[in-house]
Structure formats: structure tokens, C-alpha cells
Interface confidence: medium
Amino acid sequence: EAHKSEIAHRFKDLGEQHFKGLVLIAFSQYLQKCPYEEHIKLVQEVTDFAKTCVADENAENCDKSIHTLFGDKLCAIPKLRDNYGELADCCAKQEPERNECFLQHKDDNPNLPPFQRPEAEAMCTSFQENPTSFLGHYLHEVARRHPYFYAPELLYYAEKYNEVLTQCCTESDKAACLTPKLDAVKEKALVAAVRQRMKCSSMQRFGERAFKAWAVARMSQRFPNAEFAEITKLATDVTKINKECCHGDLLECADDRAELAKYMCENQATISSKLQACCDKPVLQKSQCLAEIEHDNIPADLPSIAADFVEDKEVCKNYAEAKDVFLGTFLYEYSRRHPDYSVSLLLRLAKKYEATLEKCCAEGDPPACYGTVLAEFQPLVEEPKNLVKTNCELYEKLGEYGFQNAVLVRYTQKAPQVSTPTLVEAARNLGRVGTKCCTLPEAQRLPCVEDYLSAILNRLCVLHEKTPVSEKVTKCCSGSLVERRPCFSALTVDETYVPKEFKAETFTFHSDICTLPDKEKQIKKQTALAELVKHKPKATEDQLKTVMGDFAQFVDKCCKAADKDNCFATEGPNLVARSKEALA
């Protein structure tokens, strides 16, 4: 229904705390360089204004759209052009073009230092002194680094952060309590960030229809007892919610997400038997719980998929009458039977089925033509199954770090033109798939592996799009979202690449490496590995192993030496010479 004042309506629905959090996220995602203090001032002004509109919906400007109100606030920032350059040009536009312009200027790789977690004691002190400000900083720092982070989910992670600090800051060994718990929250949040970026990419590049197909497949896997119309209702709502968040309508997005959770909890009987535990929780936890819900049990009496979609004599008639609905029912029926498949695979199968009907229904004997379609699915199913098998075996053999290195070599050979930091980031993330998925039961491995890889590769595409350097990457990234992962998997060594000349300084290290945390040490070594491959793209596994082993020994030896600087200075050139020789 229409409201006189949109901002008053959202304030009342969301409550002050969530309203302020969401406004802070919105501003931080639009203007990623502004300090916290500047944003929090704007948030307070917007909140005060919203309160006046709650008191009197007819007050001046209360009837303006939220985009107009937010945009006017952002455009009033002094020195906007000095800090943001051409983003300031957006302010000359009218809504909705102005908001579109802001969205286009979101930076997926902002030039911000990595978020450093303070010492446990310092964290607890600032948390206890001002929890609201502490959590505000958290929202600001995450949102500006991840401008597409799903806002209501970020509020949930802030709540988790709050819980961990509340619990651990009373312990005697604060660090021992905080570190593993905050690491777990961080890991989940980083995965959530790449997953949501993939959803926004899907929406931006391929529109609502493609996203809705993704949602139908996902919902059908989770809720196999729900009827098709119920699944499409949920998919329609989820599509709307994601469109709003991806489009910067964070208040509407969070409000609609809460509404959907309410609907699901009121209609458990027609959706799933697994919802009750989620429905007893407060709003943020309820929505998150529902988003992560385990699959309901598949109905025992499901007939073969072939009955309606291959053997039925009216397949072509049903398809012709309403293509979208018929293909939707196919996707629903196939997905509810296959929680063990990735959504990407299910969408590839639906695409294959559609192409088969398009071809066969125009021929003289359609049933003979489409009669073998299910058998033709087999290679499409086998390909990702083999991918999971070989990669999980490799992960089990090498461990996470070794597996990351294998992936790094593979991807540097596929796309050596891509910048080393981007390759290292992608390989480290791709390599985490082992830890995340390979330890799961067999039936959960494929969906975990492929859908996670797709999200990570989307991040690679988003970064590459900013500065395109590899034709092969551009080709894989330009195609359909569901074909990306198979496209990258199929890439081989780029034969057109002219190897990088050997630069000694790239492989020159100093004693500062010794004091780095393990993760940073790994990144240094992986940076060197990528550079080695760029120098020698056809180096064998054994050659690379020799050089990297030598390098690890060198670092280890010099970090244990009494005069570290001297060791690095004298041993370094020897290492470089040996490496050149080993790779000759």
C-alpha cells in the first residue's frame, strides 16, 4: 500500500536501531572513502528527520522518496568532488538517474587498508565504553569494503559480533575467547559477501528472470514438499528483496525480508516441516536461520520426472501454451528431487531441456526427438562430479595451503595477464573450497563446491571487468553466469602469453617477513609463486616445487639467524640465482 511518508513508514517498521544501522550501511556503501564520523553525523540527521515525519507525515519533505532524501544528503557533503572525483557528477542528475549513477560508482576493490582487528584488551575497552559506536564502526568498515553486502545480513553479523564481545570481554583470557569466535564470524561474513555480490551481478547483468530461476531451484531443493505455486511465491519475494538491496534500497529490502520471514513462519504447513526452530527467534536471527535452513525431507512418492516432461504426449503443447511456467515446473520438479546438485547445474539442465524442446517441438516427430533428453543430461552431471572428486582428492593430499598453491599455479597459467594480487586473492579463496566443502557428506559436496566456486569466480570477473587484461577471462566472464565455472575449468595454459622477464627485485626479501602473521607470510610466498609462473608459464610441477621449497628453507633459515638482515642480503641473491637455474 502507498504511504504518505516512505521514510516514516520504514522507521516505524524497522525500529530506530535497525533503521540507523541500515542508513549507516547505505552511506558507507555509496561513499566508501568517508570517515565514520562524517557518516554517523549524516545518519543522525536522517534519523532526526525520520522522527519528525513519524510525528507528522505532512511535515515538509516527508513525502520525498528515500533515494531523494539520501541523495540530497550525500550531495550536500562538502568537498565531494575533491574526494570522489566524477562521482560528484551524479549530483547534477535527477532521481532515479542520480541513484543509478551512485550505484555505477561503487568500487568493488576500494583502495582501503585491510581491516586490522585491534588487540583483545583494546577491543574490549572500546566496546565496553561505547558498544553502539564500536558496532557502528564495524558496520562502516565492512560496508565500505563490501559495497554490495546484503544489508540485513550485515546487521545480523554485527549482532553476532556484539554477542561474542559481550561474552568474551568478561573472560580472563580475552584473546583466547575472542580470536576463534571472531575468526568464525569473519569467515562466514566474507563468504556471505561474495555470495551476495554474485546475486547482484546476476540481477545487474541478466535481470530478474535469471535471478528468479536461481531462486526457484534453490527453494525447490530446500522445500521439496511445497507446491510449485508456493515455491514461485517465495522466489518472487526473494527476487524483489535482493533487487532492492542490490539497488541500494536497503530500508525497503530489510523491511520486506522481515515480512517474508513472517509469512514463512505463518505458513509453515505449506512450506516445510523444518522451520519451527527458526520461527521462535527474534527478527534478524529468524531471517538468517530461514536463509540457512536445512533441506526438508523429499516426499517418498514422487513419480519419475520423465512422466510429465518426456513421456507425456502433450509436452510440446504444454510448453507452447506457457513456456515460462512449463520450464518453471520442470526446474521445480528436477530441483526438489536433487538437493545433491548445485543450483548452477540445475540451471544448466533446465537450459538444456529448453533448448531440446525448442528444437524438437519444431520437428516432425517431437517425442522421438526429445525422448533421449534425460540421457543427454548425463555428461552435464558428470563434469562437476568429476571436478569435485579430483579437487577434493588433491585437497586431501596437499592440505589447504598446498591446494591453494596448486590452484594458483593453474589459474596463473590460464590467465597470466591478470594482476598478481588478484590471482593470489582468487586462488586463496578458491583453495578454501577444500576446507569448506570436501569434509562434508558426499551428497552435500557438489552443491557446496560448485556454488562456492561460482561466487568466487564472479568476484574475479568483477575485478577483471574494472581493468580487463585477459581475453580468456573476458570470454568466460561475458557468458552466462551458470556457464562461468565450466568455462574457467576448461581453460588451459595461455599460449599467446609472452613470459614476463625475470626481475630479481620481485624475488628479493627482507627480514620484515619474519615478523609477519602466518597468513601474510603465505601471501608473500604465493605472490612469489605467481610471479615465477608468469616468468615460466610452462614450468613443471617438480620445478616449481623445488624453487618454492628452496624459498621456504631460505626464509626459515634467515628468520632463525642472529643477523637476519645480513642473512637476507647475502643468501637472497644466491636463492635468485638457484631459482633461475632450476627454471632454465
Partner: nanobody, 119 residues
């Protein structure tokens, strides 16, 4: 016992409008998705439109998109089909049906109401 009673059919000129109603009883209407199907003389059943239990979303066969609107009033246990810009090829017996738990098959339908579009 499930009962579905359609009404509102009749003779109408091309370009004209009609509103069909379907009174439902014997099952929980507000938790059931519903649809309209039709059967033209000498032809098979063709589905026309589906509506979710809550009223949205709705789906239409390509042949009626933009001309027909399905709606429901859960407080009255009634399903509606507003038909505008009617064409000769819309001539058929229209049935309302309870949507099944899966697949585009129809669990129950009424006795139907005849719509004739002719000048």
C-alpha cells in the same frame, strides 16, 4: 467434499468483457493455489491462469497475457477471472480448479461455465 461452482459465462461480442466467479467449499481455500482452465469445442484442456493462495504471484498462459486478470477473495472463498478484449478463440467452457501439490495437473474442477465470443 470439494465443490467448485463457476458462474458468469455468456455470449459476448469480440472486444467485450466478462467476469467469471467460482465459489469454493469443502477444503481450506486460503491455503490452496487455484487456477482457471478452459476447453474449446473439440479441443483438449488448456490452462489459463494460476493464482497463489495469498493472491500473488499470478501466472497466465501466453495467449491471455495482458487481457485476463485472475484474483481471489479468501474471506468469501471465491476465485475470479476478469476477461477483457475477448476474441473468438477465447470461446470455451471455463473451469476453475484447485491447484495440485505439483505438476500442471488439476486435482478437482467444477462443472464449468460457457463463454461464447461471437458477433
Amino acid at each position: 467434499e470439494v465443490q467448485l461452482l463457476e458462474s458468469g459465462g455468456g455470449l459476448v461480442q469480440p472486444g467485450g468483457s466478462l467476469r467469471l466467479s467460482c465459489a469454493a467449499s469443502g477444503f481450506t481455500f486460503d491455503t490452496s493455489s487455484m487456477l482457471w482452465v478452459r476447453q474449446a469445442p473439440g479441443k483438449g484442456l488448456e490452462w489459463v491462469s494460476v493464482i497463489h493462495q495469498s493472491g500473488t504471484p499470478t501466472y497466465y498462459a501466453d495467449s491471455v497475457k495482458g487481457r485476463f486478470t485472475i484474483s481471489r477473495d479468501n474471506s468469501k472463498n471465491t476465485l475470479y477471472l476478469q476477461m477483457n478484449s475477448l476474441r473468438a478463440e477465447d470461446t470455451a467452457v471455463y473451469y476453475c480448479a484447485k491447484f495440485p501439490s505439483s505438476r500442471m495437473k488439476f486435482d478437482y474442477w467444477g462443472q464449468g461455465t460457457l463463454v461464447t465470443v461471437s458477433s
